[in-house]
Structure formats: C-alpha cells, structure tokens
C-alpha cells in the first residue's frame, strides 16, 4: 500500500534537483576562480540539510544558517543591483556590466535561480510531486524562506549607491509585497547606503511618460526617505537601447542613456 503523501498546490521539486545544484555549483566555481576552493559536495550537503526530513510548511531562516555560512562571498558592496518583476533584463545588464551583481550572480543565488524544492517531514525523500504554494498553502516553505534569507543578507551587505531595476509595465511599479518591497527595502543599512537609485524600465516603445512620478514610486521614495536614505529615479525609455549603450558606451547616440 503506497504511503499517503501530502498534496500541495504548487509544482514539485525540479527534476534532477540534487544533480542540478551540484552541477551549477561546479560551473560557478569554474566561472569565478575566486571561488575555486569551494567544495560543492559540502555546499549540497548543507543545502539538503536545510529542508530534507522537515515539514515543508515549517521551514525557518535558522534552517538555512549552515548554508548561509558560505554566503560570505565578497561582492563589492557598492556594485549591487536589486530588481523587481524584471529579472531577465537585470541579468542581461549584469552580463554586460560585469562589475555589477544581482543576487543571482552570487553563488547561492545562482544555485537556486528558477528552481523549486521541498522535502517531507520525517523522511529523507525529496518531493517531486508537489511543493507548498506561497499563497495557497504556506509562506514558510523551503523556496520562499531561502529567497527571503538570501535577499535579506544581500540587502544588508549593500553600501554607497544601490540600484534597483523596476518594471514600468506593471500596474504596481513598486510592489510592497514583492521580495524587493517586503525584504530588501527594509534591510538596506542607512549607515552604509547613501542612495537608492531606481531605474524604471518602460515597456511601450512610444511610452514617454515620466514613470518616476508614479504613485507607487512616490511610495517607495517615502519609505526610503523615512529610513534616512536618499532616493533618485531614472526612466529607461528604451531598454534595448539602454543595453546597447552599456555594451558600447562610446556610441555617439548614447549620451542621454545611463
């Protein structure tokens, strides 16, 4: 008789999850020689230890602390790019602007990007059938707690001018319920961070509105200002042109781009 298994509302663990994490770790250490001495098997053991045999609705930041001990990777604190609802462009940007880093450019972010995982209470099995959905099941699930933990630490590490890329096509350009709005904004350290600079990315080709005047951006400005951090905002009217100018800043048509 098959053992009863909890059915969750979200998709199950990404297939070949252990192999994927291990392979990503090895690839990362090859791409980033400053991490060449990292033992990826130990990284996987710590990752696994955070959620295996634990109830997937009862995961805490404490469960990830052994793994977080690896998170002392030295990303330049003044070269951090946060993003909300516009991951692909943010990653395209840091692939070109090699001295800036999103969370997914760090080892831990790189390992987990776009993956889902969960275990089962009291068994060493990984659940490939279903995992808890943040809204329908519980917020303290392995994936959500992981991203909350690494996002908090990433924001805490930031200094000087911090940039954030926001999606100007969404009804809420700044969303208080996003990871950026609920975690990162509140964990920037005012004694280290001088300015948060928002880059609002326009979607429509003919969209010439000043989205920095959007009510949600004003709300973000208010939250940041109350935390004694300066706020600035720039419209990126043509993201394709923006990326092109990052690649070729000497292009004469790029004077007005960041």
């Amino acid at each position: 008789v098959p053992r009863w298994r909890q059915q969750w509302s979200g998709p199950g663990t990404t297939k070949r999850f252990p192999e994927t994490v291990l392979a990503r770790c090895v690839k990362y250490t090859e791409i980033h020689p400053e991490m060449r001495h990292v033992d990826c098997q130990s990284v996987w053991d710590a990752f696994k230890g955070a959620f295996i045999s634990k109830h997937p609705c009862n995961i805490t930041e404490e469960d990830y602390q052994p793994l977080m001990k690896l998170g002392t990777q030295t990303v330049p604190c003044n070269k951090i790019l946060l993003w909300s609802r516009i991951k692909d462009l943010a990653h395209q940007f840091t692939q070109v602007q090699r001295d800036m880093f999103t969370l997914e450019d760090t080892l831990l972010g790189y390992l987990a990007d776009d993956l889902t995982w969960c275990g089962e209470f009291n068994t060493s099995k990984i659940n490939y059938q279903s995992c808890p959905d943040w809204r329908k099941d519980c917020s303290n699930n392995p994936v959500s707690v992981f991203w909350k933990t690494v996002s908090r630490r990433f924001a805490e590490a930031a200094c000087d001018v911090v940039h954030v890329m926001l999606n100007g096509s969404r009804s809420k350009i700044f969303d208080k319920n996003s990871t950026f709005g609920s975690v990162e904004v509140h964990n920037l350290q005012p004694e280290k961070v001088q300015t948060l600079e928002a880059w609002v990315i326009h979607g429509g080709r003919e969209d010439s509105r000043d989205l920095c005047q959007d009510p949600t951006i004003k709300e973000l400005e208010s939250i940041i200002s109350k935390r004694n951090i300066q706020f600035s905002c720039k419209n990126i009217y043509r993201p394709d042109k923006f990326l092109q100018c990052v690649k070729n800043p000497e292009d004469s048509s790029c004077t007005s781009e960041i």
Epitope: P33, E34, R36, H37, V38, D39, S42, V43, A46, P66, K69, L70, T72, T74
Partner: antibody, heavy 118, light 110 residues
C-alpha cells in the same frame, strides 16, 4: 617542467624594506593565481598573500596586510612581494607557489631567507 | 595558535598505517577543499592531496585523504622511512579571506 626561483632575501633591520622576486617558467604564468607562503624558524607554514590571474585581485594574511604588497608582471613571468615596516616576527623562509585550479599549491620554489634583526 | 588543529606528532613502525587529523570550522574545512602538504627540512613543500582526497600524479596511493563535516584526515599506509616529514593540512577560510594551515604534524618512523 615548472620552475619557481625566489630571490631578494637577506638581512634587514626592523622597520626596513625588502622586495622579493620569483621568476617563473615552464607554464603559462598569466593563467594562474600565485602566492607567497612563509615558514619562520621552528614554526609551521603560514600563507602570506595571493594574487589572481587576469585583472589582479590581491589577498593578504592579517599579519601582513597594510605592510606587504603582492604584485605580478605577466610580461616578465615574475611575481613580487614588497615588504615594508618589517618586524622581527617576519623572519622566515619565503616560498613562491603556483596555485592549481582548485586552490591547491601545486608547485613551490626552494625559498629565500629573510632575516629581520638589528 | 593555528586556525586548523593538528596533532604535533604521529609515529608508527615500517609498514604500519598512520592517520593524521585536521580539525577546523564551517568557515574553512566545512565549505572548502582540504589540501595536504609534505615538508622535508631544507626542501620545498610538496602537494600530497588536493580537493579532499585527490592525489597529484606521482604521489603514491599509500597516501589518502578524507573529509567529513569540519574535519579532515590524512592516512599513510605501508609507512616507509622516506615518509618521515612534517605534514600540513590547509584550506581557504571565508572569515579571514585567505588560506589557513594547520600547525603541522611530525611523522616519525620507528
């Protein structure tokens, strides 16, 4: 075969300076991280500093940070260690080492003796 | 005081097996590769083990390395007189942003 030959050691007074060199051959010098490791008389091995390949990033032991500077000249296949504000406790044999792809010190020079004494 | 802890000495008769321990923490051995070096007085140190348990070519298979958690060990089986030397473990340490060595273990063949 890989060869690492250190030079520049000698006797120096406390507070003085010395520049060590390491001539490398037998491998593509510019591709590899390089390090200095030392051994004080009767003591164990102690890592001193490392320098990355490519656009150089430098790493230092707390005991030498701010006093020693590691650098490299890929055109000359040479590694250097500029040692300032020397102290008696810096007395040691200084080894130049090549790092492997997993961070191990694969090849070592024979060492050069630095004595700091008045 | 070394960051990695090794016994100061170890000994065995010819042909015996000797094990040297190396104890650290999550900031060094826990998440990083362990390396072992053999050092004979007056010569350059020699790499014996890298990536916890890998032997460079030319190192006899009498030497083996292992790692578990925050500790590592080096085993020398079939001890020979030429194995008399100082042995050092090493690893990268995140909190120091540099390499750390053990204090060294002197192996004597009785």
């Amino acid at each position: 075969q890989v060869q690492l030959v250190e030079s520049g050691g000698g006797l120096v007074k406390p507070g003085g300076s010395l520049r060590l060199s390491c001539a490398a051959s037998g491998f593509t010098f510019s591709d590899d991280y390089m390090s200095w490791i030392r051994q004080a008389p009767g003591k164990g091995l102690e890592w001193v500093a490392s320098v990355s390949s490519g656009r150089p990033t430098t790493y230092y032991a707390d005991s030498v940070r701010g006093r020693f500077t590691i650098s490299r000249d890929n055109a000359k296949n040479s590694l250097y260690l500029q040692m300032n504000s020397l102290r008696a406790e810096d007395t040691a044999v200084y080894y130049c080492a090549r790092e492997g792809w997993s961070g191990e010190f694969t090849d070592w020079g024979q060492g050069t003796l630095v004595t700091v004494s008045s | 005081q070394s960051v990695l802890t090794q016994p100061p000495s170890a000994s065995g008769t010819s042909g015996q097996r000797v094990t040297i321990s190396c104890s650290g923490s999550s900031s060094n051995i826990g998440f990083h590769f362990v390396y072992w070096y053999q050092h004979l007085p007056g010569t350059a140190p020699k790499l014996l083990i890298y990536k916890n348990n890998q032997r460079p070519s030319g190192v006899p298979d009498r030497f083996s390395g292992s790692k578990s958690g925050n500790s590592a060990s080096l085993a020398i089986s079939g001890l020979r007189s030429e194995d008399e030397a100082d042995y050092y473990c090493a690893a990268w340490d995140d909190s120091l942003s540099g390499y750390v060595f053990g204090s060294g273990t002197k192996v004597t063949v009785l």
